[in-house]
Amino acid sequence: LPEMAQPVDPAHNVSRLHRLPRDCQELFQVGERQSGLFEIQPQGSPPFLVNCKMTSDGGWTVIQRRHDGSVDFNRPWEAYKAGFGDPHGEFWLGLEKVHSITGDRNSRLAVQLRDWDGNAELLQFSVHLGGEDTAYSLQLTAPVAGQLGATTVPPSGLSVPFSTWDQDHDLRRDKNCAKSLSGGWWFGTCSHSNLNGQYFRSIPQQRQKLKKGIFWKTWRGRYYPLQATTMLIQPMAAEAAS
């Protein structure tokens, strides 16, 4: 199966009369209603493969999926930048690809969480994702939708850079969150969320181990390793972010 990081074979030439869709939302806008894998080509980017989820709210690009621990998410900066995993299973699309989709537009970020009892939570944020020059900073541009309200972090307006164990951009001076936890994430103070943490099929006894797991503090708590997560993004209409 192709790795998410692999570009499409450049030998395939797009016709002079046609082009690849820019993103999943454009596919939805031209009438596509089938979810699945599509080749897209955002402006100025090489083509790449994405998972599109078509819903009543339009077309969403899946940027992260966890559900079985089959893929190691404790990877360095370059891996998180390029993307990794299996498009049919667990994967991280890649920060550069996500940024090529969103450009300078504000976007909706949907976060789907599931615990081991079958309970699910859907959160929606209005966000702006910066480029590599900002360490792919994620800024909440509006309050979140969903049960958890504004208790989710980062707070509106705060911009949080992405961090990995080899590129520490978190908001703590005394600690490397990615190193002491696991995986790459928009770490603020290490304790609010980490959907790219270590996958635990059973809850470890030691809290030291447990803190490395996949968690969303304001939902099931800091030390509850979640069973499944999906992150989806959808750029908003044309006007640029302020």
Partner: nanobody, 120 residues
Framework: EVQLVESGGGLVQAGGSLRLSCAAS????????TGWYRQAPGKQRELVAS???????TYADSVKGRFTISRDNAKNTVHLQMHSLKPEDTAVYFC??????????????WGQGTQVTVSS
């Protein structure tokens, strides 16, 4: 404009197999979905199978496990392998492709169709 030309239809006995091919006049790489539809006499055209540019497959319930769609970007062709054919599979089979133009408009292309007749 992309021209789609179907081939491989014919008369076959129930339980037999056929392989339909759809050749495109230019690169199918930019066709985000390609598929096969069929229309039996007096009935509406219905989706048989489709494949996205990334390889995701959709099949009509009536053909699941019997038909397989595939796409060859290098040869600009789409195939429909049909096994365990039944009389109710008798129809004209049409190739379909959908794309976005450089003018940002959606385009839908259809072939002329190829007749498949399954005798009992």
């Amino acid at each position: 404009e992309v021209q789609l030309v179907e081939s491989g239809g014919g008369l076959v006995q129930a339980g037999g197999s056929l392989r339909l091919s759809c050749a495109a006049s230019e690169s199918i790489f930019s066709l985000y979905v390609t598929g096969w539809y069929r229309q039996a006499p007096g009935k509406q055209r219905e989706l048989v199978a489709s494949i996205t540019s990334g390889g995701s497959l959709t099949y009509a319930d009536s053909v699941k496990g019997r038909f397989t769609i595939s796409r060859d970007n290098a040869k600009n062709t789409v195939h429909l392998q049909m096994h365990s054919l039944k009389p109710e599979d008798t129809a004209v089979y049409f190739c379909n492709g959908r794309s976005i133009g450089v003018d940002d408009m959606p385009y839908v292309y259809w072939g002329q169709g190829t007749q498949v007749t399954v005798s009992s």
